[in-house]
């Protein structure tokens, strides 16, 4: 089949990194600068991706493979192949239409990306709050109040590292 295809289509002999040049009697010509072909038999080369602005080059373009971008420090990739760069925020914040904003009271974000999420409601699981939540950390749920009744083995909660986060907007 390959042999038959080659006889029918001379372009099928052109390897990756070249294109079948119709202007030159279907000779295999190397891809011009800043372009590539990742498969054989191509009639054109694709333009290399350019990593500009907040995008930085992770892998240079070659004649056979496209450039790969990631994000400059302070940003992180979104989408397939890092098609977008989103600004980081600090822990305890989320990215809003007004930039990075502190999590509202009762919510937290322990990452530099994503949204503030509500603290766990310990009482829904019949438990009590062992360590208060902050803007950066979820609450820690402890034993249920019934488990702490007189006679039951008591748990001394560790002192919270800081006051509960409070950031009314």
């Amino acid at each position: 089949f390959e042999r038959t295809r080659s006889l029918q289509d001379p372009c099928s002999n052109c390897p990756a990194g070249t294109f079948c040049d119709n202007n030159r009697n279907q000779i295999c010509s190397p891809c011009p600068p800043n372009s590539f072909s990742s498969a054989g038999g191509q009639r054109t080369c694709d333009i290399c991706r350019q990593c500009k602005g907040v995008f930085r080059t992770r892998k240079e373009c070659s004649s056979t493979s496209n450039a790969e971008c990631d994000c400059t420090p302070g940003f992180h990739c979104l989408g397939a192949g890092c098609s977008m760069c989103e600004q980081d925020c600090k822990q305890g914040q989320e990215l809003t239409k007004k930039g990075c904003k502190d999590c509202c009271f009762g919510t937290f974000n322990d990452q530099k990306r994503g949204i503030c999420r509500p603290w766990t409601n310990c009482s829904l699981d019949g438990k009590s709050v062992l360590v208060n939540g902050t803007k950066e950390r979820d609450v820690v749920c402890g034993p249920s109040p019934a488990d702490l009744s007189p006679g039951a083995s008591s748990v001394t909660p560790p002192a919270p590292a800081r006051e509960p986060g409070h950031s009314p907007q």
Epitope: R49, C51, K52, G53, V54, F55, C69, L78, C82, S83, M84, C85, E86, Q87, L95, T96, K97, K98, G99, C100
Partner: nanobody, 122 residues
Framework: EVQLVESGGGLIQPGGSLRLSCAAS????????MSWARQAPGKEFEWVSS???????YYVESVKGRFTISRDNAKNTLYLQMSSLRAEDTAVYYC????????????????WGQGTQVTVSS
């Protein structure tokens, strides 16, 4: 060919004012959302301000009330009026298209200028 060319940067004393311009060509400026970003020496890139084609504006908290983004569609030009400048505003300022329409988020297909240096120092 798309081009974004920033100008208007320079050395300015604290408390002073500057107006940055970004001349756009090669695309339909009037229907494009645009933004400014900056990078201070040794610091990370930071989104500064964005403007929709409608004229709606957004600013990072640290420049709110001091910087004003605007556009002149007849001149295909984006502006950043900067006043009450502080030492911490020292950076290279970049003009860019803003296809995501999401604050602090840029797409790989966005275009960027080469930047203009703003130095705030006495």
């Amino acid at each position: 060919e798309v081009q974004l060319v920033e100008s208007g940067g320079g050395l300015i004393q604290p408390g002073g004012s500057l107006r940055l311009s970004c001349a756009a060509s090669g695309f339909t400026f009037s229907s494009s959302a645009m933004s400014w970003a900056r990078q201070a020496p040794g610091k990370e890139f930071e989104w500064v301000s964005s403007i929709y084609s409608s004229g709606k504006t957004y600013y990072v908290e640290s420049v709110k009330g001091r910087f004003t983004i605007s556009r002149d569609n007849a001149k295909n030009t984006l502006y950043l009026q900067m006043s009450s400048l502080r030492a911490e505003d020292t950076a290279v300022y970049y003009c860019a298209t803003w296809k995501t329409l999401r604050v602090g988020v840029w797409d790989e297909s966005d275009y960027w200028g080469q930047g203009t240096q703003v130095t705030v120092s006495s």
